[in-house]
């Protein structure tokens, strides 16, 4: 008789999840010499240990500490790019501007990017059918707690000028409920971080409006200023040209603001 299985509202664990995590780890450590010492089997064991046999609504940051320890990585603290609701462009940017890093350019972010996972209480099985949805089921699920943990650590490590890419095509350019708004903003360290510089990315349509004047950006400025961090904001009116100019900064059309 098949055992009753909890039905959650979100999609189940990504197929071939263990193999994907292990393969990504191997690939990452091959590409990044400074992480060559990492034992990917140990990384997978620690990852698995964070959620296997545990109720997928009772995961804590503590559960991920062994994985965090194994994935400890030093990135230049003054070269951090945060993003909110505009992941693809942020990643395209760091692929070109190789000395800057998003969370997904670190080992732990790279391992988990775009993946879903969860287990079941008291069984060693991975649930490939469904996993808890953050809104409909519970916030302390394996995926949400993972990203909260790594995002907090990433923000805590930042220093000097921190950049954040924000999506100007959203109704809330800055959203207090996003990972950036709820975790990263509050974990930037005022004694280390001098300035948060927001890049507001305009959508495909041409526009001359200054989205740095948007009320949600003013709200972000207020939050940041209260934390004794300076705030600045730039419009990226043409993201395609912005990327092109990152690739070819000497191009004559790249002298003006983009």
């Amino acid at each position: 008789v098949p055992r009753w299985r909890q039905q959650w509202s979100g999609p189940g664990t990504t197929k071939r999840f263990p193999e994907t995590v292990l393969a990504r780890c191997v690939k990452y450590t091959e590409i990044h010499p400074e992480m060559r010492h990492v034992d990917c089997q140990s990384v997978w064991d620690a990852f698995k240990g964070a959620f296997i046999s545990k109720h997928p609504c009772n995961i804590t940051e503590e559960d991920y500490q062994p994985l965090m320890k194994l994935g400890t990585q030093t990135v230049p603290c003054n070269k951090i790019l945060l993003w909110s609701r505009i992941k693809d462009l942020a990643h395209q940017f760091t692929q070109v501007q190789r000395d800057m890093f998003t969370l997904e350019d670190t080992l732990l972010g790279y391992l988990a990017d775009d993946l879903t996972w969860c287990g079941e209480f008291n069984t060693s099985k991975i649930n490939y059918q469904s996993c808890p949805d953050w809104r409909k089921d519970c916030s302390n699920n394996p995926v949400s707690v993972f990203w909260k943990t790594v995002s907090r650590r990433f923000a805590e490590a930042a220093c000097d000028v921190v950049h954040v890419m924000l999506n100007g095509s959203r109704s809330k350019i800055f959203d207090k409920n996003s990972t950036f708004g709820s975790v990263e903003v509050h974990n930037l360290q005022p004694e280390k971080v001098q300035t948060l510089e927001a890049w507001v990315i305009h959508g495909g349509r041409e526009d001359s409006r200054d989205l740095c004047q948007d009320p949600t950006i003013k709200e972000l400025e207020s939050i940041i200023s209260k934390r004794n961090i300076q705030f600045s904001c730039k419009n990226i009116y043409r993201p395609d040209k912005f990327l092109q100019c990152v690739k070819n900064p000497e191009d004559s059309s790249c002298t003006s603001e983009i």
Epitope: S171, R209, E257
Partner: antibody, heavy 118, light 112 residues
Framework: QVQLVQSGAEVKKPGSSVKVSCKAS????????MSWVRQAPGQGLEWMGD????????FYGEKFEDRVTITADKSTSTAYMELSSLRSEDTAVYYC???????????WGQGTLVAVSA | DIVMTQTPLSLSVTPGQPASISCRSS???????????LHWYLQKPGQSPQLLIY???NRFSGVPDRFSGSGSGTDFTLKISRVEAEDVGVYYC?????????FGGGTKLEIK
């Protein structure tokens, strides 16, 4: 062909409010800013503010931001402009105008006369 | 706010003759995205304004080629190569480089 059809003329008392509507014929209504521009009798044009219906982003001219409310109903492709605390100097023709290209008002409604008189 | 100043206030032109209207802005209209958002509208008697020229020199669809625009920075010109009777009305320059969008005071074109 883009058409903007506005509501009819209104006569209002000082201190009251008026709400003017503007119905668009176009399927691109949600993704184009809709502006409101007014013209007092014998005077020039004055931009009041605009809205991007699909995400509800609104910009107001500083002169109007305390008294004007711009809204849009995507389901009916209709934009609205409500002006409160009316005074005699608000007597004007109020136009809605839709972008043809980014930040360029290419299509205009026929105008709605709002007369404010005691 | 950016102030747009038009000259002359009015002009009277014989059909077939050229006409020129000037527009000056209180600050540069060159936007940081590389565009200059200076436009020209015509408001014919009893009608709504209609777009003639956008971004300094681009004719809007259906606008006759006798209308042309030029200029940069803060100084702009609308030219009508050969005025026709249907060109009467008030011409407005407008900027949308900086919020709030602003309009010139208008230039009234009459036929002699």
């Amino acid at each position: 062909q883009v058409q903007l059809v506005q509501s009819g003329a209104e006569v209002k008392k000082p201190g009251s409010s008026v709400k003017v509507s503007c119905k668009a014929s176009s399927e691109v209504f949600p993704t184009s800013y809709m502006s409101w521009v007014r013209q007092a009798p014998g005077q020039g044009l004055e931009w009041m503010g605009d809205i991007l219906p699909n995400i509800g982003r609104i910009f107001y001219g500083e002169k109007f931001e305390d008294r004007v409310t711009i809204t849009a109903d995507k389901s009916t492709s209709t934009a609205y402009m409500e002006l409160s605390s009316l005074r005699s100097e608000d007597t004007a023709v109020y136009y809605c105008a839709r972008e043809a290209y980014g930040s360029i008002l290419g299509y205009w409604g026929q105008g709605t006369l709002v007369a404010v008189s005691a | 706010d950016i102030v747009m100043t038009q000259t002359p206030l009015s002009l009277s032109v014989t059909p077939g003759q050229p006409a020129s209207i000037s527009c000056r802005s209180s600050q540069s209209l060159l936007h940081s995205n590389g565009n200059t958002y200076l436009h020209w509208y015509l408001q014919k008697p009893g009608q709504s304004p209609q777009l003639l020229i956008y971004k300094v020199s681009n004719r809007f669809s259906g606008v006759p080629d006798r209308f042309s625009g030029s200029g940069s920075g803060t100084d702009f010109t609308l030219k009508i190569s050969r005025v026709e009777a249907e060109d009467v009305g008030v011409y407005y320059c407008s900027q949308s480089s900086h919020l709030p969008w602003t309009f010139g005071g208008g230039t009234k074109l009459e036929i002699k």
